[in-house]
Interface confidence: low
Amino acid sequence: MSRGLQLLLLSCAYSLAPATPEVKVACSEDVDLPCTAPWDPQVPYTVSWVKLLEGGEERMETPQEDHLRGQHYHQKGQNGSFDAPNERPYSLKIRNTTSCNSGTYRCTLQDPDGQRNLSGKVILRVTGCPAQRKEETFKKYRAEIVLLLALVIFYLTLIIFTCKFARLQSIFPDFSKAGMERAFLPVTSPNKHLGLVTPHKTELV
């Protein structure tokens, strides 16, 4: 089999791999996150939920202890019992959702008659939450803003230095003409340059 065909088949197989299911909920509403672990007749299970952090780390607090952002997390399926017979057991109930609840959650099912562990992931997207306060937005993107400003200052310094060096070396002897100096104003003026380069807030999100 040719390498190209192998790569094509591999990419097809990858695209067919089951994606982590996503649950969308409107801000401040309650949501039931289903446990997507593969079901096995070894029941009843004891379920535990964790929220996965961006770095792959796990927030190890148990959801039923209400540690996650002060929200109320309710587990059905603990010790094989659940609230309503028509509801899927082992789901995670999050009340009064906020944008903080968005993220990836993992459920782990443990069988007391053998400790068989099964796990599944689900992504929660909380939509329609009011915009964050300006200081929160600034805190969130502080590193990006500082880096951007540093780059702007660096390029400004480089341009100014280049222009001065060029003038000193008389590379551009005719550039002292008024018309040409006016042409360079947008570049050499830091305020105007910043105005051209600084992205709008929407671009930072």
């Epitope: 079901w39 096995d40 007749p41 070894q42 029941v43 009843p44 399926g77 094989g80 019992s81 659940f82 017979p85 899927r88 057991p89 069988d111 008659d113 053998g114 400790q115 068989r116 562990n117 099964l118």
Partner: antibody, heavy 115, light 109 residues
Amino acid sequence: EVQLVQSGGAVVQPGRSLRLSCAASGFTFSTYGMHWVRQAPGKGLEWVAAVSYDGSNKYYADFVKGRFTISRDNPKNTLYLQMNSLRADDTAVYYCARRGGLDIWGQGTTVTVSS
Amino acid sequence: LTQSPLSLPVTLGQPASISCKSSQSLVDSDGNTYLNWFQQRPGQSPRRLIYKVSNRDSGVPDRFSGSGSGTDFTLKISRVEAEDVGVYYCMQGTHWPRTFGQGTKVEIK
């Protein structure tokens, strides 16, 4: 008391159908996976089929695939085994059992397939 | 699963041992080993004695014990009593389909 009470066993002709029932009591039936195991006369135990607590997952032994169907009615606390196209070698005592570890067993019901 | 011996005549009060060998490892991806032992007395339904290799079910006398790992497992009866007569089966719960051993008939000499 936790128990499984079976019914539905009978003498049937080859090619005919039969439905076995297993009524559960003394535990929350809807939270347990359930199994069917059979035992031919003078032989050992043979696993037949299993169903997850909510009926969404079903597993079968190769020799019954396409002929037998396992199902459950949680509100009625009852497990079923629908047996179609019965053959002489399906003659056995059929047991229902609870969860993957088969910790509780029914009393068994006899199915005889004979012409 | 292959059990041996298929027949085990024992003297009351003496120990008995039954072997169960699997053609493949019974260690699950979760690290656990799902090997159960059942007792079937004459004319009765099977009864589970041991689950997950060595865990005794409630109500099971402590003269019954299970051991082993991977593919080789053993059920031991430290002192056989008259009520222990019957057929003993091992069963694996790691792979689908579930499978039983052929059974070992324990009888008094």
